[in-house]
Interface confidence: medium
């Protein structure tokens, strides 16, 4: 049973799934200049038995026949229903959940695909929200939605999560903007919010007592 | 002992008006982490249940710092006590070096 | 509060050793699971953050896994200043809580 509806939607958040339930689609759009091939399926589809899953069909892209390169891809009408669309990339992913049984894994990317991918997701699709860059998890907590069936409806439940932004404060002398990183979240590897080696705190201690309190601090 | 305990947190490097919660844990000798409340700039704040009726967290924007303060102090309160940045979902990435408060009567 | 129980309490290696250290939480935390070593007279140190991502500056050899109630961590190949005290911590909800403590001592 396909989701009616979209993941709900977060400000300054995105979604993504970290493994596909069975019976998911995933258009294959090609990018700007390229098209589908003649023969080529309109989607992927997650199928499998009860102990493997895999993607159906495969997506390819060729170059387009006319030198509009600037012309978008228009989705087949089949196609404009249900677009749940998500473009991105988690290194928090658990690494277990992607092989659990009834799931695919994230599709590998074809030759020119769309920068976006447009998923169809099925009843009980679970995903997960992080702040865009720049933003920050203001709470804990699971910033997750599953997509279920109550009284013959699909209806996505609500991620408890909430994203700020202050890039004005939160940005320091010789920083650049950091890249998207979970929610918000400082990355080494790319540009940092706060760069852990400038960033130190120290504790000073102050007594009011009637008893005594005796302190050393550690260096 | 019915004294105050009053610590502050000195923050450098940033501002504490990042979108950053900041958090206070301590470790009683020998043993292991306990996490004790958090402050956001706004002045919003989490406390842990167990010590709650005990603890306030406060910051003080234009000297970059936060403090706590933890009233009716007894020996159990024994413990070195850190500031941390906390990053919410992904742990607590920054910390003090700590500072050992002893109770004692 | 969600509770958290590592195990071993402490465990003796050797330097090159593979070392495992589990924490169990008593309900599920989806990935929300963070790893920090701690040395004498040190603050926490964070190593691991969501579960299995290693965060900057630490070394390859530090490895997480999991998700729910069950995560792993694991030292490939045990280096002398590893010999520390490991803490598992849940951020899943608040009260953050840390597990008590594995520490891991030469043989």
């Known amino acids: 049973e396909l989701c009616d509806d979209d993941p709900p939607e977060i400000p300054h958040a995105t979604f993504k799934a970290m493994a596909y339930k069975e019976g998911t689609m995933l258009n294959c759009e090609c990018k700007r200049g390229f098209r589908r091939i003649k023969s080529g399926s309109l989607y992927m589809l997650c199928t499998g038995n009860s102990s493997h899953s895999s993607w159906d069909n495969q997506c390819q892209c060729t170059s387009s026949a006319t030198r509009n390169t600037t012309k978008q891809v228009t989705p087949q009408p089949e196609e404009q229903k249900e677009r749940k669309t998500t473009e991105m990339q988690s290194p928090m992913q658990p690494v277990d959940q992607a092989s659990l049984p009834g799931h695919c894994r994230e599709p590998p990317p074809w030759e020119n695909e769309a920068t976006e991918r447009i998923y169809h997701f099925v009843v009980g699709q679970m995903v997960y929200y992080q702040c865009v860059q720049g933003y920050r998890a203001l709470h804990r907590g699971p910033a997750e939605s599953v997509c279920k069936m109550t009284h013959g409806k699909t209806r996505w439940t609500q991620p408890q999560l909430i994203c700020t932004g202050e890039m004005e404060t939160s940005q320091f002398p010789g920083e650049e903007k950091p890249q998207a990183s979970p929610e918000g979240r400082p990355e080494s590897e790319t540009s940092c919010l706060v760069t852990t080696t400038d960033f130190q705190i120290q504790t000073e201690m102050a007594a009011t007592m009637e008893t005594s309190i005796f302190t050393t601090e550690y260096q | 002992p019915s004294g105050t305990l009053s610590l502050t947190c000195a923050v450098s490097?940033?501002?504490?008006?990042?979108?950053?919660?900041w958090s206070w844990v301590r470790q009683p000798p020998g043993k292991g982490l306990e996490w004790i409340g958090e402050i956001y700039h706004s002045g919003s704040t989490n406390y842990n249940p167990s010590l709650k009726s005990r603890v306030t967290i406060s910051v003080d924007k234009s000297k970059n710092q936060f403090s706590l303060k933890l009233s009716s102090v007894t020996a159990a309160d024994t413990a070195v006590y850190y500031c941390a940045r906390d990053l919410m979902n992904y742990g607590m990435d920054v910390w003090g070096q700590g500072t050992t408060v002893t109770v004692s009567s | 509060d969600v509770w958290m129980t590592q195990s071993p309490s402490s465990l003796s290696a050797s330097v090159g050793d593979r070392v495992t250290i589990t924490c169990r939480a008593s309900q599920s935390i989806s990935s929300y699971l963070n790893w920090y070593q701690q040395k004498p007279g040190k603050a926490p140190k964070l190593l691991i953050y969501?579960?299995?991502s290693l965060q900057s500056g630490v070394p390859s050899r530090f490895s997480g896994s999991g998700s729910g109630t069950d995560f792993t961590l694991t030292i490939s190949s045990l280096q002398p200043e590893d010999f520390a005290t490991y803490y598992c911590?849940?951020?899943?909800?608040?009260?953050?809580?840390f597990g008590q403590g594995t520490k891991v001592e030469i043989k």
């Open positions: 490097g940033g501002s504490i008006s990042s979108s950053n919660w």
């Open positions: 911590q849940q951020s899943y909800s608040t009260p953050p809580t």
């Open positions: 969501a579960a299995s």
